[in-house]
Protein backbone atom coordinates (compact mmCIF):
# COMPACT_ATOMS: atom_id res chain seq x y z
CA UNK A 1 0.00 0.00 0.00
CA UNK A 2 1.40 3.41 -0.96
CA UNK A 3 -0.35 5.46 1.73
CA UNK A 4 -1.50 5.09 5.29
CA UNK A 5 -5.22 4.47 5.55
CA UNK A 6 -7.37 7.59 5.87
CA UNK A 7 -10.95 7.44 7.13
CA UNK A 8 -13.80 9.83 7.80
CA UNK A 9 -13.87 10.77 11.49
CA UNK A 10 -17.07 11.60 13.35
CA UNK A 11 -18.40 11.13 16.86
CA UNK A 12 -21.97 12.13 17.64
CA UNK A 13 -22.50 14.33 20.69
CA UNK A 14 -23.10 12.22 23.78
CA UNK A 15 -21.28 9.17 22.46
CA UNK A 16 -19.29 7.52 25.24
CA UNK A 17 -15.71 6.60 24.47
CA UNK A 18 -13.63 7.99 21.65
CA UNK A 19 -11.61 6.42 18.86
CA UNK A 20 -9.66 9.65 18.25
CA UNK A 21 -6.54 8.05 19.70
CA UNK A 22 -6.57 5.39 16.96
CA UNK A 23 -5.30 7.90 14.41
CA UNK A 24 -4.06 11.38 13.64
CA UNK A 25 -6.69 13.94 12.69
CA UNK A 26 -5.94 15.85 9.49
CA UNK A 27 -6.51 19.58 9.49
CA UNK A 28 -9.24 19.75 6.85
CA UNK A 29 -10.92 23.03 7.72
CA UNK A 30 -14.59 23.35 8.55
CA UNK A 31 -16.54 22.60 5.38
CA UNK A 32 -14.90 19.26 4.61
CA UNK A 33 -15.49 15.95 6.37
CA UNK A 34 -13.06 15.42 9.21
CA UNK A 35 -10.37 12.93 8.27
CA UNK A 36 -8.24 10.67 10.42
CA UNK A 37 -5.09 8.82 9.39
CA UNK A 38 -5.12 5.41 11.04
CA UNK A 39 -2.28 4.56 13.40
CA UNK A 40 -2.80 0.85 14.05
CA UNK A 41 -4.76 -0.56 11.14
CA UNK A 42 -5.64 -0.10 7.50
CA UNK A 43 -9.33 -0.33 8.34
CA UNK A 44 -12.16 2.19 8.68
CA UNK A 45 -15.42 1.67 10.54
CA UNK A 46 -18.82 3.29 10.66
CA UNK A 47 -21.74 2.95 13.05
CA UNK A 48 -25.29 4.03 12.19
CA UNK A 49 -28.37 4.03 14.39
CA UNK A 50 -31.48 3.07 12.46
CA UNK A 51 -34.76 4.17 14.00
CA UNK A 52 -37.85 3.44 11.92
CA UNK A 53 -36.91 4.86 8.51
CA UNK A 54 -34.14 7.18 9.65
CA UNK A 55 -30.44 6.32 9.84
CA UNK A 56 -28.20 8.56 11.93
CA UNK A 57 -24.44 8.31 12.00
CA UNK A 58 -23.07 7.65 15.49
CA UNK A 59 -19.34 7.12 14.91
CA UNK A 60 -16.85 6.95 12.07
CA UNK A 61 -13.12 6.43 12.30
CA UNK A 62 -10.24 3.95 12.35
CA UNK A 63 -10.35 0.43 13.70
CA UNK A 64 -7.74 -0.57 16.23
CA UNK A 65 -6.65 -3.57 14.16
CA UNK A 66 -7.22 -5.30 10.85
CA UNK A 67 -9.92 -7.90 11.33
CA UNK A 68 -12.35 -9.90 9.19
CA UNK A 69 -14.42 -7.46 7.17
CA UNK A 70 -11.57 -4.99 6.76
CA UNK A 71 -10.79 -6.37 3.32
CA UNK A 72 -14.13 -5.03 2.05
CA UNK A 73 -13.85 -2.18 -0.47
CA UNK A 74 -17.14 -0.63 0.62
CA UNK A 75 -19.11 -0.09 3.79
CA UNK A 76 -21.76 -2.80 3.95
CA UNK A 77 -23.28 -2.49 7.43
CA UNK A 78 -24.64 -5.40 9.39
CA UNK A 79 -26.86 -5.19 12.46
CA UNK A 80 -24.98 -5.41 15.73
CA UNK A 81 -27.18 -4.37 18.65
CA UNK A 82 -30.48 -2.89 19.87
CA UNK A 83 -29.51 0.03 22.12
CA UNK A 84 -33.18 0.83 22.72
CA UNK A 85 -36.58 -0.49 21.57
CA UNK A 86 -37.20 0.37 17.94
CA UNK A 87 -33.59 1.20 17.10
CA UNK A 88 -30.79 -0.92 15.66
CA UNK A 89 -27.08 -0.23 15.49
CA UNK A 90 -25.47 -1.15 12.18
CA UNK A 91 -21.69 -1.31 11.82
CA UNK A 92 -19.32 -1.73 8.93
CA UNK A 93 -15.62 -2.22 8.45
CA UNK A 94 -13.81 -1.57 5.18
CA UNK A 95 -10.33 -1.12 3.84
CA UNK A 96 -10.14 1.75 1.35
CA UNK A 97 -9.66 5.47 1.93
CA UNK A 98 -12.83 7.20 3.19
CA UNK A 99 -14.85 4.03 2.58
CA UNK A 100 -16.72 4.71 5.84
CA UNK A 101 -18.18 8.00 4.59
CA UNK A 102 -21.41 6.35 3.50
CA UNK A 103 -22.97 2.91 3.57
CA UNK A 104 -23.98 1.13 0.40
CA UNK A 105 -27.32 0.05 1.88
CA UNK A 106 -28.89 -0.78 5.21
CA UNK A 107 -30.81 -4.03 5.58
CA UNK A 108 -34.36 -3.36 6.80
CA UNK A 109 -34.81 -3.79 10.56
CA UNK A 110 -35.94 -7.27 11.44
CA UNK A 111 -34.31 -8.79 8.37
CA UNK A 112 -32.54 -12.12 8.77
CA UNK A 113 -29.42 -11.72 10.85
CA UNK A 114 -30.79 -8.91 12.99
CA UNK A 115 -30.10 -9.64 16.65
CA UNK A 116 -33.17 -10.56 18.63
CA UNK A 117 -34.69 -8.55 21.45
CA UNK A 118 -32.57 -10.16 24.13
CA UNK A 119 -30.38 -7.03 24.30
CA UNK A 120 -27.12 -5.82 22.77
CA UNK A 121 -24.96 -8.41 21.05
CA UNK A 122 -21.44 -8.08 19.78
CA UNK A 123 -19.30 -10.31 17.68
CA UNK A 124 -16.02 -11.37 19.33
CA UNK A 125 -13.60 -8.47 19.48
CA UNK A 126 -16.27 -5.90 18.71
CA UNK A 127 -16.87 -4.55 22.19
CA UNK A 128 -15.75 -1.15 20.89
CA UNK A 129 -19.12 -0.79 19.19
CA UNK A 130 -20.85 -1.17 22.50
CA UNK A 131 -19.14 1.83 24.05
CA UNK A 132 -21.91 4.07 22.82
Amino acid sequence: PPNRRTCVFFEAPGVRGSTKTLGELLDTGTELPRAIRCLYSRCCFGIWNLTQDRAQVEMQGCRDSDEPGCESLHCDPSPRAHPSPGSTLFTCSCGTDFCNANYSHLPPPGSPGTPGSQGPQAAPGESIWMAL
Epitope: P1, P2, N3, R4, R5, T6, E24, L26, T28, L32, P33, A35, C38, L39, Y40, S41, R42, D66, D97, F98, A101
Partner: antibody, heavy 113, light 112 residues
Framework: QVQLVQSGAEVKKPGASVKVSCKAS????????VSWVRQAPGQGLEWMGE????????NFNEKFKGRVTMTTDTSTSTAYMELRSLRSDDTAVYYC??????WGQGTLVTVSS | DVVMTQSPLSLPVTLGQPASISCRSS???????????LEWFQQRPGQSPRRLIY???NRFSGVPDRFSGSGSGTDFTLKISRVEAEDVGVYYC?????????FGQGTKLEIK
Protein backbone atom coordinates in the same frame (compact mmCIF):
# COMPACT_ATOMS: atom_id res chain seq x y z
CA GLN B 1 -3.67 3.84 -19.84
CA VAL B 2 -3.15 6.20 -16.92
CA GLN B 3 -2.07 9.67 -18.01
CA LEU B 4 -1.51 12.96 -16.20
CA VAL B 5 -1.10 16.01 -18.44
CA GLN B 6 0.04 19.25 -16.85
CA SER B 7 -0.31 22.86 -17.96
CA GLY B 8 2.50 24.73 -19.69
CA ALA B 9 5.48 26.63 -18.33
CA GLU B 10 4.88 29.89 -16.44
CA VAL B 11 7.00 32.94 -15.72
CA LYS B 12 5.94 34.92 -12.66
CA LYS B 13 7.15 37.93 -10.71
CA PRO B 14 7.97 37.71 -7.00
CA GLY B 15 4.83 38.12 -4.89
CA ALA B 16 2.54 36.81 -7.61
CA SER B 17 0.61 33.52 -7.65
CA VAL B 18 0.68 30.57 -10.00
CA LYS B 19 -1.93 27.88 -10.61
CA VAL B 20 -0.76 24.63 -12.20
CA SER B 21 -3.30 22.18 -13.61
CA CYS B 22 -3.07 18.42 -13.97
CA LYS B 23 -5.63 16.60 -16.13
CA ALA B 24 -6.01 12.91 -15.38
CA SER B 25 -7.30 10.15 -17.64
CA UNK B 26 -7.32 6.37 -17.83
CA UNK B 27 -8.52 5.73 -14.27
CA UNK B 28 -11.25 6.70 -11.82
CA UNK B 29 -10.05 10.13 -10.75
CA UNK B 30 -11.91 10.18 -7.43
CA UNK B 31 -10.41 6.90 -6.18
CA UNK B 32 -6.79 8.03 -5.83
CA UNK B 33 -4.91 10.77 -4.00
CA VAL B 34 -3.18 13.32 -6.22
CA SER B 35 0.27 14.22 -4.93
CA TRP B 36 2.26 17.36 -5.74
CA VAL B 37 6.05 17.29 -5.76
CA ARG B 38 8.48 19.97 -6.86
CA GLN B 39 12.08 19.99 -8.03
CA ALA B 40 14.26 23.09 -8.07
CA PRO B 41 16.79 23.30 -10.94
CA GLY B 42 19.55 20.73 -10.40
CA GLN B 43 18.10 19.77 -7.02
CA GLY B 44 16.23 16.87 -5.50
CA LEU B 45 12.51 16.18 -5.06
CA GLU B 46 10.34 17.86 -2.42
CA TRP B 47 6.89 16.64 -1.36
CA MET B 48 4.34 19.46 -1.19
CA GLY B 49 1.15 17.63 -0.31
CA GLU B 50 -1.75 15.59 -1.61
CA UNK B 51 -5.49 15.84 -2.13
CA UNK B 52 -8.28 13.26 -2.31
CA UNK B 53 -10.56 14.33 -5.18
CA UNK B 54 -13.68 12.57 -3.91
CA UNK B 55 -14.05 14.90 -0.92
CA UNK B 56 -11.34 17.54 -1.23
CA UNK B 57 -9.48 16.45 1.89
CA UNK B 58 -5.84 17.46 1.61
CA ASN B 59 -2.65 16.91 3.53
CA PHE B 60 0.11 19.52 3.21
CA ASN B 61 3.76 19.86 3.95
CA GLU B 62 3.75 22.44 6.78
CA LYS B 63 6.45 24.33 4.88
CA PHE B 64 3.83 25.42 2.34
CA LYS B 65 0.90 25.92 4.69
CA GLY B 66 -0.82 29.21 4.07
CA ARG B 67 0.76 29.60 0.64
CA VAL B 68 -0.54 26.56 -1.20
CA THR B 69 -4.06 25.53 -2.15
CA MET B 70 -4.84 22.19 -3.74
CA THR B 71 -8.20 21.72 -5.41
CA THR B 72 -9.84 19.33 -7.86
CA ASP B 73 -12.60 19.50 -10.43
CA THR B 74 -14.11 16.03 -10.61
CA SER B 75 -16.24 16.92 -13.65
CA THR B 76 -13.08 17.34 -15.74
CA SER B 77 -10.79 15.01 -13.71
CA THR B 78 -8.40 17.89 -13.14
CA ALA B 79 -6.30 18.72 -10.10
CA TYR B 80 -4.95 22.19 -9.40
CA MET B 81 -2.13 23.46 -7.25
CA GLU B 82 -1.96 27.18 -6.52
CA LEU B 83 1.12 28.67 -4.88
CA ARG B 84 0.92 32.25 -3.64
CA SER B 85 3.45 34.92 -2.61
CA LEU B 86 6.02 33.49 -4.98
CA ARG B 87 9.72 33.92 -4.25
CA SER B 88 12.73 33.29 -6.43
CA ASP B 89 13.41 30.02 -4.60
CA ASP B 90 10.01 28.74 -5.76
CA THR B 91 11.50 28.41 -9.24
CA ALA B 92 11.10 24.70 -9.91
CA VAL B 93 9.45 22.01 -11.98
CA TYR B 94 6.14 21.12 -10.32
CA TYR B 95 4.88 17.56 -10.76
CA CYS B 96 1.52 16.02 -10.07
CA UNK B 97 1.24 12.28 -9.55
CA UNK B 98 -1.46 9.73 -8.92
CA UNK B 99 -0.48 8.52 -5.45
CA UNK B 100 3.11 8.71 -6.70
CA UNK B 101 2.73 5.79 -9.11
CA UNK B 102 2.03 7.69 -12.34
CA TRP B 103 3.47 11.17 -12.86
CA GLY B 104 2.71 14.16 -15.02
CA GLN B 105 5.36 15.59 -17.33
CA GLY B 106 6.03 18.51 -14.99
CA THR B 107 5.41 22.26 -15.23
CA LEU B 108 8.34 24.67 -15.04
CA VAL B 109 7.53 27.74 -12.96
CA THR B 110 10.13 30.50 -13.13
CA VAL B 111 9.96 33.30 -10.57
CA SER B 112 12.00 36.28 -11.67
CA SER B 113 11.76 40.04 -11.48
CA ASP C 1 11.07 16.20 9.71
CA VAL C 2 12.41 12.73 8.96
CA VAL C 3 15.75 13.01 7.17
CA MET C 4 16.49 10.45 4.47
CA THR C 5 20.22 10.04 3.86
CA GLN C 6 21.38 8.24 0.74
CA SER C 7 24.81 6.88 -0.05
CA PRO C 8 26.73 7.04 -2.22
CA LEU C 9 25.66 10.30 -3.86
CA SER C 10 27.48 9.30 -7.03
CA LEU C 11 27.69 5.72 -8.29
CA PRO C 12 29.81 4.89 -11.35
CA VAL C 13 29.06 1.33 -12.48
CA THR C 14 30.28 -0.90 -15.29
CA LEU C 15 27.57 -2.23 -17.60
CA GLY C 16 26.42 -5.67 -16.52
CA GLN C 17 27.75 -5.23 -12.99
CA PRO C 18 25.59 -4.96 -9.85
CA ALA C 19 24.85 -1.69 -8.06
CA SER C 20 23.62 -0.95 -4.57
CA ILE C 21 22.22 2.24 -3.04
CA SER C 22 21.71 2.73 0.69
CA CYS C 23 19.05 4.87 2.33
CA ARG C 24 18.96 5.64 6.05
CA SER C 25 16.09 7.39 7.83
CA SER C 26 16.43 9.46 10.98
CA UNK C 27 13.42 7.64 12.50
CA UNK C 28 11.99 4.17 12.04
CA UNK C 29 9.71 3.93 9.04
CA UNK C 30 7.66 1.07 10.41
CA UNK C 31 4.19 2.43 11.03
CA UNK C 32 1.72 1.36 13.71
CA UNK C 33 -0.29 -0.63 11.16
CA UNK C 34 2.69 -2.90 10.56
CA UNK C 35 3.58 -1.50 7.14
CA UNK C 36 6.74 0.37 6.18
CA UNK C 37 5.98 3.17 3.74
CA LEU C 38 9.33 3.32 1.95
CA GLU C 39 9.56 3.78 -1.82
CA TRP C 40 12.27 4.10 -4.47
CA PHE C 41 12.08 6.29 -7.57
CA GLN C 42 14.17 6.54 -10.69
CA GLN C 43 14.54 9.79 -12.60
CA ARG C 44 16.19 9.49 -15.98
CA PRO C 45 17.77 12.65 -17.44
CA GLY C 46 15.08 15.10 -18.57
CA GLN C 47 12.22 12.85 -17.45
CA SER C 48 9.66 12.74 -14.65
CA PRO C 49 10.31 10.46 -11.69
CA ARG C 50 9.16 6.85 -12.01
CA ARG C 51 8.24 4.60 -9.12
CA LEU C 52 10.33 1.44 -8.90
CA ILE C 53 9.57 0.02 -5.46
CA TYR C 54 6.90 0.57 -2.81
CA UNK C 55 6.52 -0.93 0.64
CA UNK C 56 10.29 -1.55 0.85
CA UNK C 57 10.41 -4.52 -1.52
CA ASN C 58 7.37 -4.55 -3.85
CA ARG C 59 8.23 -3.89 -7.49
CA PHE C 60 5.83 -1.58 -9.28
CA SER C 61 4.22 -2.91 -12.45
CA GLY C 62 6.52 -2.91 -15.47
CA VAL C 63 9.69 -2.60 -13.40
CA PRO C 64 12.34 -5.15 -14.46
CA ASP C 65 13.16 -7.83 -11.92
CA ARG C 66 16.79 -6.77 -11.83
CA PHE C 67 15.60 -4.06 -9.40
CA SER C 68 15.01 -5.18 -5.82
CA GLY C 69 14.45 -3.44 -2.51
CA SER C 70 15.13 -4.61 1.02
CA GLY C 71 15.55 -3.37 4.57
CA SER C 72 13.56 -2.52 7.67
CA GLY C 73 13.35 0.07 10.42
CA THR C 74 15.81 2.78 9.42
CA ASP C 75 18.08 0.99 6.89
CA PHE C 76 17.04 0.30 3.32
CA THR C 77 18.76 -0.79 0.12
CA LEU C 78 17.97 -0.66 -3.58
CA LYS C 79 19.90 -3.21 -5.65
CA ILE C 80 20.29 -3.53 -9.39
CA SER C 81 21.55 -7.00 -10.22
CA ARG C 82 23.02 -6.12 -13.65
CA VAL C 83 23.17 -2.48 -14.65
CA GLU C 84 21.98 -1.61 -18.16
CA ALA C 85 22.49 1.61 -20.11
CA GLU C 86 18.86 2.66 -19.56
CA ASP C 87 19.40 2.63 -15.78
CA VAL C 88 21.40 5.88 -15.90
CA GLY C 89 19.76 8.60 -13.82
CA VAL C 90 19.12 9.69 -10.26
CA TYR C 91 17.58 7.36 -7.69
CA TYR C 92 15.59 8.65 -4.73
CA CYS C 93 14.27 6.93 -1.64
CA UNK C 94 11.07 8.32 -0.15
CA UNK C 95 9.16 7.83 3.08
CA UNK C 96 5.41 8.24 3.54
CA UNK C 97 5.30 7.02 7.14
CA UNK C 98 5.74 10.43 8.78
CA UNK C 99 4.42 13.87 7.85
CA UNK C 100 5.80 15.63 5.99
CA UNK C 101 6.74 12.88 3.55
CA UNK C 102 10.39 13.26 2.57
CA PHE C 103 12.79 12.22 -0.18
CA GLY C 104 16.44 11.32 0.06
CA GLN C 105 18.87 13.70 -1.65
CA GLY C 106 19.35 11.35 -4.59
CA THR C 107 22.06 9.04 -5.93
CA LYS C 108 23.37 9.64 -9.43
CA LEU C 109 24.09 6.40 -11.27
CA GLU C 110 26.40 6.69 -14.26
CA ILE C 111 28.16 4.23 -16.52
CA LYS C 112 31.92 3.88 -16.08
Amino acid sequence: QVQLVQSGAEVKKPGASVKVSCKASGYTFTDYWVSWVRQAPGQGLEWMGEIYPKNGVSNFNEKFKGRVTMTTDTSTSTAYMELRSLRSDDTAVYYCARQRDYWGQGTLVTVSS
Amino acid sequence: DVVMTQSPLSLPVTLGQPASISCRSSQSLEYGDGYTYLEWFQQRPGQSPRRLIYGVSNRFSGVPDRFSGSGSGTDFTLKISRVEAEDVGVYYCFQATHDPNTFGQGTKLEIK
